[in-house]
């Protein structure tokens, strides 16, 4: 029972997490325009992986699409690449995992395949959840370092009265949904290893041994020895791990040229 | 079409508030942002903040701060903006203006204006 | 705050003839995240209220007739009325839209001659 709720478990944050991994990629706010140098901003900036938008006063917003790959930057080519590995591992997973449920019969699957695909969709989930911290982690390392330099040249070029005001951006809603979509990910892959360890047999059927008495006919049957033989059949003895993760599901979306430098 | 009809005139002792109203009339009341711009005898336009009908959300020129006051009715459909401890230079014609909702936030529509006089 | 500057304070042109009015101001205008400039010019005519004739530095209010051209970017702009009729004797303002508070220049006030 435990081994069937560790995997449940395993399963359902890993599909909350999968799914904060798409709407985080989805956001358009990965990059907010600081406001802590300019906190009277008429119009509100923010970028997403595929378009940056424009919100005005009135409250309305324009967004528009980078309409070229070979414009942008490396690393936003190398966020992107990693954030959708990270779904489309994860949505393997999520498939591979739905037939590995120990509560779901599917014809005569044993458990041994059960256990197999377990694990499959438990490393899938947990270089799912990597690729997503990796691929937030390294935007956010790309506005640390785009900060600081916007920061030094903020008041580069000014020409007597006249302010040229360079645009910063600081860390938006979707890097905090993709830090906490990837954790829950891996948090749910770590839990589908450990049921798969639950869900391997560690049985050994040894032949039953008939003796025959004297003027009777019974057949004595010893149970079998329990020996750690990592696949074989049916498992009685299961091991209780038990896993909780809280997840943030919060996720807003507002309301061009790429603008990192 | 859209319409924005200010109060009458009103004459002041210095000290004293006015209170001016704006009553909107042609468009959705809490869908756009209204603003106040006033204009001193013979002088340019000056800003003097926002309200938001929607959320009653306000935003304030600091020159102004602590003497303006902002409020709406959505009832009526109706802005009003107060200003107090009147001085002789806060003589000048009160506008309401309706920011555009993609007009780059230019104000599209303006009130007739209200003439509010300072005076001992 | 930002501070707009136009000039000349006030010009006189012949009916038919060419108007320009220029806006400069103390921060740049332009949005870097939409390449857009937030500057508006108004007409007012004595006794009226504010008319907004462009927006977005460049874009013609609607039924704002086209011999009203706005054109500029950052912190310079122009306003050029390309053919001057009787009914455009007014005051001009431009205005910033892209920071609080918003501010107007001085006004340009325009005549006959």
């Known amino acids: 029972m435990a081994v069937t709720a560790c995997q449940g478990l395993g399963f359902v944050v890993s599909l909350i997490g999968i799914a904060g991994i798409i709407a985080a990629t989805c956001m358009d706010q990965w990059s907010t325009q600081d406001l802590y140098n300019n906190p009277v901003t008429a119009v509100f900036n923010y970028q997403g992986l595929w378009r940056s938008c424009v919100r005005e006063s009135s409250g309305f917003t324009e967004c528009r699409g980078y309409f070229t790959l070979l414009g942008l930057p490396a690393m936003l080519q190398a966020v992107r690449a990693l954030m959708i590995v990270g779904i489309v591992l994860g949505a393997i997973g999520l498939l591979v995992s739905i037939f590995a449920l120990k509560c779901i019969r599917i014809g005569s699957m044993e458990d041994s395949a059960k256990a197999n695909m377990t694990l499959t969709s438990g490393i899938m989930f947990i270089v799912s959840g990597l690729c997503a911290i990796a691929g937030v982690s390294v935007f956010a390392n790309m506005l640390v370092t785009n900060f600081w330099m916007s920061t030094a040249n903020m008041y580069t070029g000014m020409g007597g009265m006249v302010q040229t005001v360079q645009t910063r951006y600081t860390f938006g809603a979707a890097l905090f949904v993709g830090w906490v979509a990837g954790g829950l990910t891996l948090i749910g892959g770590v839990m589908m290893c450990i049921a798969c360890r639950g869900l391997a047999p560690e049985e050994t059927n040894y032949k039953a041994v008939s003796y025959h008495a004297s003027g009777h006919s019974v057949a004595y049957k010893p149970g079998g020895f329990k020996a750690s033989t990592g696949f074989g059949s049916n498992t009685k003895n299961k091991k209780i791990y038990d896993g909780g993760a809280r997840t943030e599901d919060e996720v807003q979306s507002y309301p061009s040229k790429h603008d990192y430098v | 079409q859209v319409q924005l009809v200010q109060s009458g005139a009103e004459v002041k002792k210095p000290g004293a508030s006015v209170k001016v109203s704006c009553k909107a009339s042609g468009y959705t009341f809490t869908s756009y942002i209204m603003h106040w711009v006033r204009q001193a005898p013979g002088q340019g336009l000056e800003w003097m903040g926002y309200?938001?009908?929607?959320?009653?959300?306000?935003k304030y020129n600091e020159k102004f701060k602590g003497r303006v006051t902002m409020t709406r009715d959505t009832s009526t459909s109706t802005v009003y903006m107060e200003l107090s401890s009147l001085r002789s230079e806060d003589t000048a014609v009160y506008y309401c203006?309706?920011?555009?909702?993609?007009?780059?936030?230019?104000?599209?529509?303006w009130g007739q204006g209200t003439l509010v006089t300072v005076s001992s | 705050d930002i501070v707009m500057t136009q000039s000349p304070d006030s010009l006189a042109v012949s009916l038919g003839e060419r108007a320009t009015i220029n806006c400069k101001s103390s921060q740049s205008l332009l949005n870097s995240g939409n390449q857009k400039n937030y500057l508006a010019w108004y007409q007012q005519k004595p006794g009226q209220p504010p008319k907004l004739l462009i927006y977005g530095a460049s874009t013609r209010e609607s039924g704002v007739p086209d011999r009203f051209t706005g054109s500029g970017s950052g912190t310079d702009f122009t306003l050029t009325i390309s053919s001057l009729q009787a009914e455009d004797v007014a005051v001009y303002y431009c205005?910033?839209?892209?920071?609080?508070?918003?501010?107007f220049g001085q006004g340009t006030k325009l005549e006959i001659k």
């Open positions: 205005q910033n839209d892209h920071s609080y508070p918003f501010t």
């Open positions: 203006a309706r920011l555009g909702f993609t007009t780059r936030n230019a104000m599209d529509y």
């Open positions: 309200i938001n009908p929607y959320n009653d959300g306000t």
